[in-house]
Interface confidence: low
């Protein structure tokens, strides 16, 4: 499937405080118009045994709530301003993790779908439910590739170091495009 | 605080250019959000224009891309409107405002005070 | 382009009275934003993501709605509350206003 086309290819990202990338600032997942981000959650057999069964660093199964925030949210690991997108609360689902799919598209299908252009940065961090786990892990996407068709839009890109090209495709377990994020509320200063 | 300040010419003439300049203080504008140019009209409709964002990509309305160009000057930390081929339609009070990039969370949060452009003759 | 309409366009309210204005968007859009603004003022976020206040809004303010249709109240009308308030979408390109409903003292 070429760039921009309906179909779009998946991007697997293992959202927990095992994945290195996210422990870093400037880890970026490159994607096309129309491709798919499925972020999994951390996930562990009941039984305790086998694979993912082992808590993460901190001890305890892992839970997140993952945000969509501007740049400055990105850099600071602040939550504040962003709206939640997924929450990772079922860390001991039966047979596979939760995940989360976002779709790149350029016009929203859902009512709660957002809309995404090529050439900029989206950024996305997570907090944990309890704190004994780590404390910001966040990721880039950049929507490849510049185009001036839509809505006058001429895209400056920057592509930054870090950056992942497209997975092998995965199977689709389930679709979270629609669901409604819950919008924290802001405190004192709306400046970012 | 951030602040932001337009300063225009008051008065063009039509078939000429529109220049507009806005100058930020308390803010880098090559840090975060995108700037953005809007403009209300005398009867108090307010139209997005386009935006320069904080890595220099620019968005236009459909309404004006054919006549709109929005630049910077980083070391000024200025951002400007130049709109071609004016007409006594582009009457206005131009405003700039602190806004989203492509649409990440943020609103339009900071405005300045609005400069009026009188197109004519 | 996602057209936003106010209703209604200027309304009058007495002090203490309740407050409804309705904005309707000819597309579904995911979140509402207000402004009011001010004879010779520049507009102010009041608003955001539908039913957020701004910081330093009065608490007498709310705000709903979801896909076409939004609404901004205020409970109690007070002297201050007179101006012009807008709403916004950034949903789809391009970023549209609506027209405007004014409020007046009765």
């Known amino acids: 499937q070429g760039p921009g086309g309906a179909l779009g290819n998946r991007h697997a990202v293992y959202w927990n405080s095992s994945n290195q990338h996210l422990r870093r600032e400037g880890y970026t997942v490159q994607v096309n118009v129309n491709d798919y981000l499925d972020i999994y959650c951390p996930h562990y057999n009941s039984s305790g045994v086998g694979p993912g069964a082992g808590p993460g660093p901190g001890g305890g199964a892992e839970q997140y709530v993952l945000y969509m925030v501007s740049r400055n949210g990105y850099r600071t690991c602040n939550a504040s301003q962003g709206f939640k997108r997924w929450e990772c609360n079922r860390p001991h689902a039966p047979h596979s993790p939760i995940k989360f799919s976002e779709k790149f598209q350029r016009y929203s299908a859902f009512s709660l779908g957002y809309e995404f252009h090529a050439g900029h940065e989206y950024y996305y961090i997570s907090t944990p439910t309890h704190n004994l786990h780590w404390k910001c892990l966040r990721m880039k996407v950049f929507v490849c590739c510049a185009s001036t068709s839509h809505s006058g839009e001429k895209p400056v890109p920057t592509l930054p170091q870090f950056t992942m090209g497209p997975n092998v495709k995965i199977n689709v377990l389930e679709d979270f495009e629609g669901e409604n994020p819950q919008v924290p509320k802001l405190e004192k200063s709306i400046s970012g | 605080d951030v602040h932001l300040q337009e300063t225009g010419p008051g008065l063009v003439k039509p078939s000429q250019s529109l220049s507009v300049t806005c100058t930020v203080t308390?803010?880098?504008?090559?840090?975060?959000?995108?700037w953005n140019w809007i403009r209300q009209f005398p009867g108090n409709k307010l139209e997005w224009m386009g935006y320069?964002?904080?890595?220099?990509?620019?968005r236009y309305n459909p309404s004006v891309k054919s006549r709109i160009s929005i630049t910077r000057d980083t070391s000024k930390n200025q951002f400007f409107l130049q709109l071609n081929s004016v007409t006594t339609e582009d009457t206005a009070t131009y405003y700039c405002a602190r806004g989203p990039y492509a649409g990440y969370p943020a609103w339009f949060d900071y405005w300045g005070p609005g400069t009026l452009v009188t197109v004519s003759a | 382009e996602n057209v936003l309409t106010q209703s209604p366009a200027i309304m009058s309210a007495s002090l203490g009275e309740k407050v409804t204005m309705s904005c309707r968007a000819n597309s579904s859009i995911n979140y509402m934003y207000w402004y009011q603004q001010k004879s010779d003022a520049s507009p102010k976020l009041w608003i955001y993501?539908?039913?957020n206040l701004a910081p330093g809004v009065p608490a007498r303010f709310s705000g709903s709605g979801s896909g076409n249709s939004y609404s901004l109240t205020i409970s109690s009308m007070e002297g201050e509350d007179a101006a012009t308030y807008y709403c916004?979408?950034?949903?789809?390109?391009?970023?549209?206003f609506g027209g405007g409903t004014k409020l007046e003292i009765k």
């Open positions: 916004q979408q950034f949903t789809s390109s391009p970023w549209t």
């Open positions: 993501y539908t039913s």
């Open positions: 320069i964002s904080y890595s220099g990509g620019t």
């Open positions: 308390g803010y880098s504008i090559t840090s975060d959000y995108a």
